[in-house]
Amino acid sequence: ESGYAQNGDLEDAELDDYSFSCYSQLEVNGSQHSLTCAFEDPDVNITNLEFEICGALVEVKCLNFRKLQEIYFIETKKFLLIGKSNICVKVGEKSLTCKKIDLTTIVKPEAPFDLSVVYREGANDFVVTFNTSHLQKKYVKVLMHDVAYRQEKDENKWTHVNLSSTKLTLLQRKLQPAAMYEIKVRSIPDHYFKGFWSEWSPSYYFRTPEINNSSGEMDPI
């Protein structure tokens, strides 16, 4: 008796929806790349299910994913990053569903970090700066960033600004005086590589100065 599903189990398995999605992160740990996959249906019974990637790999034919709760992942240097790989959901030796995917088209950048906002009194503006690990990378270097900010009391009224640099200037007159703002930033590949938005950076909070009555300008913080 083998350790994988018996025939009855396979028949049941074939009735299930094994749709899955994946994203890659290149040079996420030194020169290591990662690939993360998960089932789209959170109710899929994943007990005996494994993921495997074959093709477009360096030196090896296939690699198995490791499982961490509901997430399947690989960390490796062995992605060729040219051509399509075949990613399969398997139970024992049987493939239940497969997808041909070019790992360069499902790239999810790392989240930006060190977001900060500095008020310039003389210029009456706020300089927003942040950092990204992708500046040091060999592959995914060119990103589009999405800076989103809102007045803290306005739950869903986010203003978005797209930029390719890591510096943005917000004019004081475009913001409400004496108000608390929340700001955050995320990134997406913008040249050759394609994929998904990164996670949001941690939010940064800043307060706008009050209007100075004599000059009609805001007071510095």
Partner: antibody
Framework: DVQLQESGPGLVKPSQSLSLTCTVT?????????WNWIRQFPGNKLEWMGY???????TYTPSLKSRISITRDTSKNQFFLQLNSVTTEDTATYYC????????????WGQGTTLTVSS | DIQMTQSPASQSASLGESVTITCLAS??????LAWYQQKPGKSPQLLIY???RLADGVPSRFSGSGSGTKFSFKISSLQAEDFVSYYC?????????FGGGTKLEIK
């Protein structure tokens, strides 16, 4: 072709330190893979001891953590095993091997070097 | 640590017969299992990886099956050179651990 070759003293006295060398040819140890030490006791039981990753990071089996060190010399394409405070229980054949981490196998092994711990 | 229980410890068989060795993991290890052959005085040689995949250059009479916690290794038609020792090994989590081995003897 990838080849691994162990070398060492053959005989070590109890409480002393053991040093073994694995010389790799045909593949750079800084390119990829984990580079492992495995030993086989006289009764044929195999024990994985630890590895040094191509990046230089190391992982050891918990039972040896306090007395094991795996290092490397990238200019000579060698990696090393040091085992401190040896006892007669450390008498074994010591192998170096490539693999593990992102692949589920050791694909290349050295021929092994026999170590006896005796006074 | 994950315990790998391999059975039988030894088995007698005749040329041309089939034999099956089993390996039980103390917890689920997916397909992170390899099988090795070891000839006397030599280092272990990879036969099967990812539980079911045949390593390069290994004859097709060797096969592996299973996933999760129960794994099997089969030699379908024993040749004289197959009467040696076999080991399973898990790579699911460190410390990577081996089974106790199976010695095949000629009947």
């Amino acid at each position: 072709d990838v080849q691994l070759q162990e070398s060492g003293p053959g005989l070590v006295k109890p409480s002393q330190s053991l040093s073994l060398t694995c010389t790799v040819t045909g593949y750079s140890i800084t390119t990829d893979y984990a580079w492992n030490w495995i030993r086989q006791f006289p009764g044929n039981k195999l024990e994985w001891m630890g590895y040094i990753f191509y990046s230089g990071s190391t992982t050891y089996t918990p039972s040896l953590k306090s007395r094991i060190s795996i290092t490397r010399d990238t200019s000579k394409n060698q990696f090393f095993l040091q085992l401190n405070s040896v006892t007669t229980e450390d008498t074994a054949t010591y192998y170096c091997a490539r693999g593990g981490y992102d692949v589920n196998y050791f694909d290349y092994w050295g021929q092994g070097t026999t170590l006896t711990v005796s006074s | 640590d994950i315990q790998m229980t391999q059975s039988p410890a030894s088995q007698s068989a005749s040329l041309g017969e089939s034999v099956t060795i089993t390996c039980l993991a103390s917890q689920t290890i997916g397909a992170w299992l390899a099988w090795y052959q070891q000839k006397p005085g030599k280092s272990p040689q990879l036969l099967i990886y990812a539980a079911t995949r045949l390593a390069d250059g290994v004859p097709s009479r060797f096969s592996g099956s299973g996933s999760g916690t129960k794994f099997s290794f089969k030699i379908s038609s024993l040749q004289a050179e197959d009467f040696v020792s076999y080991y399973c090994q898990q790579f699911f989590s460190t410390p990577w651990t081996f089974g106790g081995g199976t010695k095949l003897e000629i009947k």
